[in-house]
Interface confidence: medium
């Protein structure tokens, strides 16, 4: 059974992930971002189900495409380089889901824009955090 300290650690990691995802969303939604229209043409795979930490496997597989889109933006709205930003997210995701997970991600039939994708995972983080508090 999870201890109170491990639950707290998980909660902090989820909050960190949530902030990183929100930072990306805020950066690309900035009204001064001239490349938003082009960024919205990129398609992302959405998880069929995202209710448990193991489902973060679906986010992990989409981190490389996410970084590619952020490289396209070359936005001054981010304090970190895309590589560093996504690398930070990757570290958190690996710790949360476990690096040796055998879960096989299933994706929904419909793809999504980067905004929809980020909102989905932001909602996921908020949902899990609410169950821990």
């Amino acid at each position: 059974a999870p201890t109170s300290s491990s639950t707290k650690k998980t909660q902090l990691q989820l909050e960190h992930l949530l902030l990183d995802l929100q930072m990306i969303l805020n950066g690309i939604n900035n009204y001064k971002n001239p490349k938003l229209t082009r960024m919205l043409t990129f398609k992302f795979y959405m998880p069929k189900k995202a209710t448990e930490l193991k489902h973060l496997q679906c986010l992990e597989e989409e981190l490389k495409p996410l970084e590619e889109v952020l490289n396209l933006a070359q936005s001054k709205n981010f304090h970190l380089r895309p590589r560093d930003l996504i690398s930070n997210i990757n570290v958190i995701v690996l710790e949360l889901k476990g690096s040796e997970t055998t879960f096989m991600c299933e994706y929904a039939d419909e793809t999504a824009t980067i905004v929809e994708f980020l909102n989905r995972w932001i909602t996921f983080c908020q949902s899990i955090i609410s169950t821990l508090t």
């Epitope: 496997q57 597989e61 989409e62 490389k64 970084e67 996504i86 690398s87 040796e100 096989m104 991600c105």
Partner: antibody, heavy 120, light 112 residues
Framework: EVQLLESGGGLAQPGGSLRLSCAGS????????MSWVRQAPGKGLEWVSG????????YYADSVKGRFTVSRDNSRNTVYLQMNSLRAEDTAVYYC?????????????WGQGTLVTVSS | QSALTQPPSVSGAPGQRVTISCTGS?????????VHWYQQVPGTVPKLLID???NRPSGVPDRFSGSKSGTSASLAITGLQAEDEADYYC????????????FGRGTKLTVL
Amino acid sequence: EVQLLESGGGLAQPGGSLRLSCAGSGFTFSSYAMSWVRQAPGKGLEWVSGITGTGYRTYYADSVKGRFTVSRDNSRNTVYLQMNSLRAEDTAVYYCVRESGHYYGWFDSWGQGTLVTVSS
Amino acid sequence: QSALTQPPSVSGAPGQRVTISCTGSSSNIGAGYNVHWYQQVPGTVPKLLIDGKGNRPSGVPDRFSGSKSGTSASLAITGLQAEDEADYYCQSYDYMLSGSVVFGRGTKLTVL
């Protein structure tokens, strides 16, 4: 022990096709991204193509884009490289390699390689 | 033309220290991507020597070490031995390239 076994190499004519297979064992196959790396005779290593654990995302080097297709069947623990419109410059040993993770990992396991020769 | 530049060859006497450089640019090593090193002994399959976090797989002696600074990386081999004679490749990622994976052209190490 991680094992990767390639097959399907051989002689093909320019413009012809070949399909390479790579069977993986000793690890949870679907949890790993896989790539194909080739080495022309007496030359260095060249990354060819990659595919994520689910198979939803595929990546290609410019030199093979539109001609090669990577795919995988996780129920059979196998990854494939369909090579069409082959050229003489595609002649090489093709290695199947396992990535350490989905996100910009390193190639931690290599197969023995299969030789593809494109010649008329 | 590879996005990562390595010297074609280096050499050293047994017991010496040699370094192999891997020079990139702001779109690969300089962008923060890790650099990985592989060793290929003549007639054999390449094998991972050092990963981007500086870790060595089991069986790789601690005589091998990697470092990175700015847009360059280097592999250092101390206490050179005859069995170290091989080709060495650096590998990273480049967001300007399709697929983004990139290898250096390789460096032939000769033990004198």
